[in-house]
Every structure is written in C-alpha cells, then in structure tokens.
C-alpha cells in the first residue's frame, strides 16, 4: 500500500548551474494524497533557513506529482546559495533536502562556460 505521507522530491546535494540575468524556475516536487499541503521556500544562511516572503511562486500539476515553483525573474548574483522547501502537513513540518544554485555573473565572466564545464566543476562558479 502506498504511503500517504507528504514527500518532497529534492535530491540531496543537488545543484543547478545558472546565469545571472536569465529567468529560472526552482521546483519542489510534492507528493501528497488528499489535500495539498501548504509549501514554502527558504534560503539557508549558515544553519538557519530564512523563509522567502513576497516572492513569485506558483503550482504546476502533473499526473503523480505537484510542483511548487520559486520564480527568479531574473536570476541575480545574490541568489547564489542553498534553498529548501518545506510542507506543512497535519501540524507537522516536512523539510526537503537543500538544493544549491551556483550563479555565474555574466558581467564578470569573460564568456559563458559550457554546461559540461559548469556541471563537472561547480566550484569554479560564482560564489
């Protein structure tokens, strides 16, 4: 029998290599059964995750999953960092793994690195 717990499908130590100035959607895939939980995004500041208020968010529904999306319009260099989504379900808080945005500031990059280069060497990116 399938579990009816809320589950948040963000991979541990996942990351996204993105460019300042581009639009970007950060997705939090949510599995639930009857009632969609309230979901929020926060940004890690050390060990504290600071709730993101007043940001453009939306839901996208697919067959087996819903996606709670945080919109970056556009990405700023200051968006670099780690993010986590949380679901409020039956008075309990379910937290996702954090996912990291590595933002390359195109103004300071002489040319856009290739996706392969960024993927294998995220530590070279804007930090």
């Amino acid at each position: 029998k399938e579990s009816c717990d809320v589950q948040l499908y963000i991979k541990r130590q996942s990351y996204h290599s993105i460019f300042a100035g581009d639009p970007f959607k950060l997705e939090c895939p949510v599995k639930y059964c009857a009632h969609r939980p309230q979901v929020t995004w926060c940004k890690l500041n050390g060990t504290t995750c600071v709730k993101l208020e007043g940001r453009h968010t939306s839901w996208k529904q697919e067959k087996n999953l819903s996606f709670f999306i945080l919109h970056f319009e556009p990405v700023l260099p200051s968006d670099n960092g780690s993010y986590r989504c949380s679901a409020n379900f039956l008075s309990a808080i379910i937290e996702s793994h954090s996912t990291t945005l590595y933002v390359t500031d195109v103004k300071s990059a002489s040319e856009r690195p290739s996706k392969d280069e960024m993927a294998s060497r995220p530590w070279l990116l804007y930090s």
């Epitope: 589950q7 499908y9 963000i10 991979k11 541990r12 130590q13 996942s14 990351y15 996204h16 290599s17 890690l44 780690s82 937290e95 793994h97 954090s98 996706k115 392969d116 993927a119 294998s120 995220p122």
Partner: antibody
Framework: EVQLQQSGAELVKPGASVKLSCTAS????????MYWVKQRPEQGLEWIGR????????RYDPKFQDKATVTADTSSNTAHLQLSSLTSEDTAVYYC????????????WGAGTTVTVSS | DVVMTQAPLTLSVTIGQPASISCKSS???????????LNWLLQRPGQSPKRLIY???KLDSGVPDRFTGSGSGTDFTLKISRVEAEDLGVYYC?????????FGGGTKLEIK
C-alpha cells in the same frame, strides 16, 4: 527490485580508451545518483565520480578528473564510464552503483567490469 | 579529502562469537541536513560490495539484526553479535557526505 547490469570484460592496449556501460532496471535513473568505483587487484575501493542523470551534472574525485568521464542516457536507463589514455595502473574492476537520490532507500552495486590494460 | 581509517586490518573470529570494527573519519560527516552519511559495505569473496548499513545505524532490508551500526561525530563502529560463516569477507566504511567520497581501507573478517 533495483538491479544493475554491467558490460563485459575489456582487454585494451596502453594509450587507448574504453567505454563501460551500466544499465539499471527496477528504477528510473532520473530519480537516482549513479556512481563509479575502482578496485585494483587485491586492493580497496576508490570513488571515481557520480552523475545526476536528471540533468547530467557530474562530480569527480580530482585524481580521476582527466582520466574518467561519466555520462548517462535516460532513454536507455544507462550510465557510462569512459576511461582515456589507459595505462597498467588502470587495470582494475570498475563497479557502477546506484542510490536513491531522495531518501536513501537503496544503494545497489553492479557485478563489476574487469578492464585489463596490456600490450 | 576526508580520510577514513578502519581498524583492525584483519579480524579472526570463531563462529558464534562477537566481532567489532572501528571506523574513524578525519572530519565530521554531518551533511547540511544534520545527518551523518556513514555507510558500511560487505564485499564477500569474489562478489561486488553490498550495503549493510546507512546513516550510521540503519540496516538495509534483508540484513540480519545481528549487525549493529553506532557512533557519532568522527567515531563509528560496526558490531556483529554472533558471527556466522556467511559474514566472512571485507567490510568497508565510507562517507557519502563530502566530495570526493572516500572509503576506509577495509577490514577482512576471517573465520577461525
């Protein structure tokens, strides 16, 4: 049940390249991390690198950065390890492994592929 | 790189007796979620490694409860309460927190 099927043994000449494959069943590899581990004869285990098949992003041990390239083909549920400029030091068993990227539910290893580098 | 140090190198145990293997990491294995990603593997002779324990103390499905993982910080232990013949092989600890991932050197469990 999650299972991995690795390609067969390889005998290759020094300086050549080889590409190993690892096909998963019982899971969509987009929901996993796939990684490769080297074991030289009668030695311990060395982590080479991993891929997130959902986006192709890779991480390597720096000592394998110029030797190994890990790729994934989600259409065939397969990961690949390419090894270049082979020397006798590359003679080893290469294991692919897969783990659940979300909840640590599974961590499964393939049977290994033996690569022998000899002229 | 995180150095994983296992002891002893070889363990010779009589069937039915307990066994204990130590694994020390050169730094904390806590990830950003506050959990320690420390695994134990068993490689039986002629076979590929198989995960026994993850997150320090959680047993993989099908692993007998005579196996116990414990520890915190940088010191971890795998215990077998009563060794059976099928337990022989090489045990490895490895950390799945820091890049690059690293393995202990292995402990060979022999049956006396």
């Amino acid at each position: 049940e999650v299972q991995l099927q690795q390609s067969g043994a390889e005998l290759v000449k020094p300086g050549a390249s080889v590409k190993l494959s690892c096909t998963a069943s019982g899971v969509n590899i987009k929901d996993t991390y796939m990684y490769w581990v080297k074991q030289r004869p009668e030695q311990g285990l060395e982590w080479i690198g991993r891929i997130d098949p959902a986006n192709g992003y890779t991480r390597y041990d720096p000592k394998f950065q110029d030797k190994a390239t890990v790729t994934a083909d989600t259409s065939s549920n397969t990961a690949h390890l390419q090894l270049s400029s082979l020397t006798s030091e590359d003679t080893a068993v290469y294991y692919c492994a897969v783990n659940d990227g979300y909840f640590e539910y599974f961590d499964v290893w393939g049977a290994g592929t033996t690569v022998t580098v000899s002229s | 790189d995180v150095v994983m140090t296992q002891a002893p190198l070889t363990l010779s145990v009589t069937i039915g007796q307990p066994a204990s293997i130590s694994c020390k990491s050169s730094q904390s294995l806590l990830d950003s979620d506050g959990k320690p990603y420390l695994n134990w593997l068993l490689q039986r002779p002629g076979q590929s490694p198989k995960r026994l324990i993850y997150l320090v103390s959680k047993l993989d499905s099908g692993v007998p409860d005579r196996f116990t993982g414990s520890g915190s910080g940088t010191d971890f232990t795998l215990k077998i309460s009563r060794v059976e013949a099928e337990d022989l092989g090489v045990y490895y600890c490895w950390q799945d927190t820091h890049f690059p991932r690293t393995f202990g050197g292995g402990t060979k469990l022999e049956i006396k």
